[in-house]
């Protein structure tokens, strides 16, 4: 659980953050786990320990292994593990699998490549990027902040794509690399400020107590492949998960890409056995993308069961 | 040194309310997560609410959700548990807590408790 | 909602003994449970946390192992004052759970 996997090229630098997190204000030791010995926080020294942070600056391929990291508050210790691999350069273009970050996919009008880890380095823009080890050039090609900006994409444009940074510590600069696979979806598209197509806003659900009851969260964010789209339910202002009602729970529907292209998203809440108490609370169904955020509110209201019987007399 | 000290307990008929206030002293209040536990007499213990220190988001127990709120005021480093329709089986030691670590999305323990204040819910 | 079951309900031992209580999830909690102690008119006192580590100013005598969904506290040598109720909690998530307890009395 609090074990993470992080790996490197030798002679790049190397930052690795502690997986045990904690408040901002608790020490961090770090530990060689083979041999217990203390990594130390001395700047002078090739490895050495920032807080939360271990720099290999340059990494060597003789540092691979796993480090213990321990985080301690004024009353409570914690440790976490980072299981770390240096490997040696390679001497041709490819790219190894176990090199790679995770890919990501790309449309038209949606195409950021996100340089992986580069949030844990100190580094000044501007990134330099490569595909398939050949320099981007052309005005098609944008380094923008921490990401890659491709416009017009093609389906051309696939591939493995590596950022290269200069990592800089007391005035001292090394290289850091880091690469991904980009697949694109060949379809024209756009993203919008999401559109709430259900519930209605202020909606009324009536549900019967002691039944299952279930509620569609469903909005639409553009057409084609939508970057940061995401609906969720809120109880009272809660997530469901720090909610702690395990009759409440949600559930991803399908994507949906509906006759007139638009892309769409559903959340389905499912309140199993409802109970009173759960007519008093505030479900807000929520839909965000980069454009922004829109709130949509449900009440849930006592349906008295229809007594069958009289709807044939 | 940290100090936790519940107050408002006391007798209320069914379906009354109570306010019950927590007093915290020997630490940063405002950013850890605070707890309401709850002891029936003769029985264990059981979680009632947890409201964060960052956000202030709750959560509450199944047996107690839409009938007691859980908030907090930092300016006065006081918790506060507000109990409406009080029922017979809400009847128990009431105690606060400070769980002194957790992340977003995460739990920890709690490792100081107040003395506990008792509620008694009786016609 | 993770069920915490203690065993035994109670256990009657003698200064000196060992003393073994152990604590069953009804489904993982990876090493996110902890051990209190509770003695008659008094609140909680935290002893073990991530299932094995001694809480600030715990006697060495008190120790926990386990992981996933075993769980045991084990006191290698009773004193007097160790006589009371334990109580297991996970808080790998909402809602918090705690164990029925176990009574450690005199035998």
């Known amino acids: 659980k609090f074990s993470k996997q992080s790996w490197g090229l030798e002679n790049e630098a190397l930052i690795v953050r502690c997986p045990r997190q904690g408040k901002p204000s608790y020490t961090v030791d770090w530990y060689y786990s083979q041999t217990n010995k203390s990594i130390p926080t001395q700047e002078r020294n090739r490895v050495f320990a920032s807080g939360q942070l271990l720099k290999f600056l340059p990494a060597a391929v003789a540092d691979s292994g796993i480090y213990t990291c321990i985080v301690r508050s004024p009353t409570f210790n914690r440790t976490g593990y980072a299981n770390v691999t240096i490997y040696k350069k390679q001497s041709d273009c490819n790219v190894p699998d176990y090199l790679m970050y995770s890919t990501v996919s790309g449309s038209e009008k949606n195409s950021k490549i996100y340089c992986p880890t580069i949030d844990l380095y100190n580094w000044t823009a501007p990134l330099e990027w490569f595909k398939n080890c050949q320099a981007l050039q052309g005005s098609r090609y944008r380094a923008h902040k921490s990401f890659l900006v491709i416009d017009n994409v093609m389906t051309e444009d696939a591939g493995d794509y590596t950022c290269k940074f200069i990592h800089n510590e007391n005035g001292a600069n090394y290289s850091v690399t880091a690469t991904r696979s980009f697949t694109v979806k060949d379809e024209q598209g756009f993203s919008l400020f999401p559109v709430i197509g259900a519930p209605a806003q202020n909606e009324i659900k009536e549900v019967e107590i002691g039944k299952n009851a279930n509620l569609t969260c469903s909005a639409c964010f553009g057409k084609g492949t939508q970057f940061l789209a995401a609906v969720l339910w809120q109880l009272n202002g809660t997530k469901i998960t720090d909610f702690g009602e395990p009759r409440i729970q949600q559930e991803e529907g399908q994507n949906q890409s509906f006759s007139n292209g638009l892309a769409c998203l559903d959340m389905v809440l499912r309140i199993a056995d409802v109970k009173e108490e759960d007519l008093l609370l505030q479900y807000d169904c929520l839909a965000l993308n980069l454009h922004g955020l829109r709130r949509h509110t449900v009440r849930l209201s006592r349906k008295n069961p229809i007594d069958h019987h009289s709807i044939y007399c | 040194e940290v100090q936790l000290l519940e107050s408002g307990g006391g007798l209320v008929q069914p379906g009354g309310s109570l306010r019950l206030s927590c007093a915290a002293s020997?630490?940063?209040?405002?950013?850890?997560?605070m707890i309401w536990v709850r002891q029936a007499p003769g029985k264990g213990l059981e979680w009632v609410s947890t409201i964060r220190g960052e956000g202030g988001g709750t959560s509450y127990a199944d047996s107690v959700k839409g009938r007691f709120t859980i908030s907090r005021d930092n300016s006065k480093n006081t918790l506060y548990l507000q109990m409406n329709s009080l029922r017979a089986e809400d009847t128990a030691v009431y105690y606060c807590?400070?769980?002194?670590?957790?992340?977003?999305?995460?739990?920890?323990?709690?490792?100081?408790w107040g003395q506990g204040t008792l509620v008694t819910v009786s016609s | 909602e993770i069920v915490l079951t203690q065993s035994p309900a109670t256990l009657s031992l003698s200064p000196g003994e060992r003393a073994t209580l152990s604590c069953r999830a009804s489904?993982?909690?990876?090493?996110?449970l902890a051990w209190y102690q509770q003695k008659p008119g008094q609140a909680p006192r935290l002893l073990i946390y991530?299932?094995?580590n001694r809480a600030t100013g715990i006697p060495a005598r008190f120790s926990g192992s386990g992981s996933g969904t075993d769980f045991t506290l084990t006191i290698s040598s009773l004193e007097p004052e160790d006589f009371a109720v334990y109580y297991c909690?996970?808080?790998?998530?909402?809602?918090?759970?705690f164990g029925q307890g176990t009574k450690v009395e005199i035998k």
């Open positions: 991530d299932a094995s």
């Open positions: 807590a400070r769980d002194p670590w957790s992340t977003e999305g995460s739990f920890f323990v709690l490792d100081y």
């Open positions: 020997g630490f940063t209040f405002s950013i850890y997560d």
């Open positions: 489904q993982s909690v990876d090493d996110d």
């Open positions: 909690q996970q808080y790998i998530t909402a809602p918090l759970t």
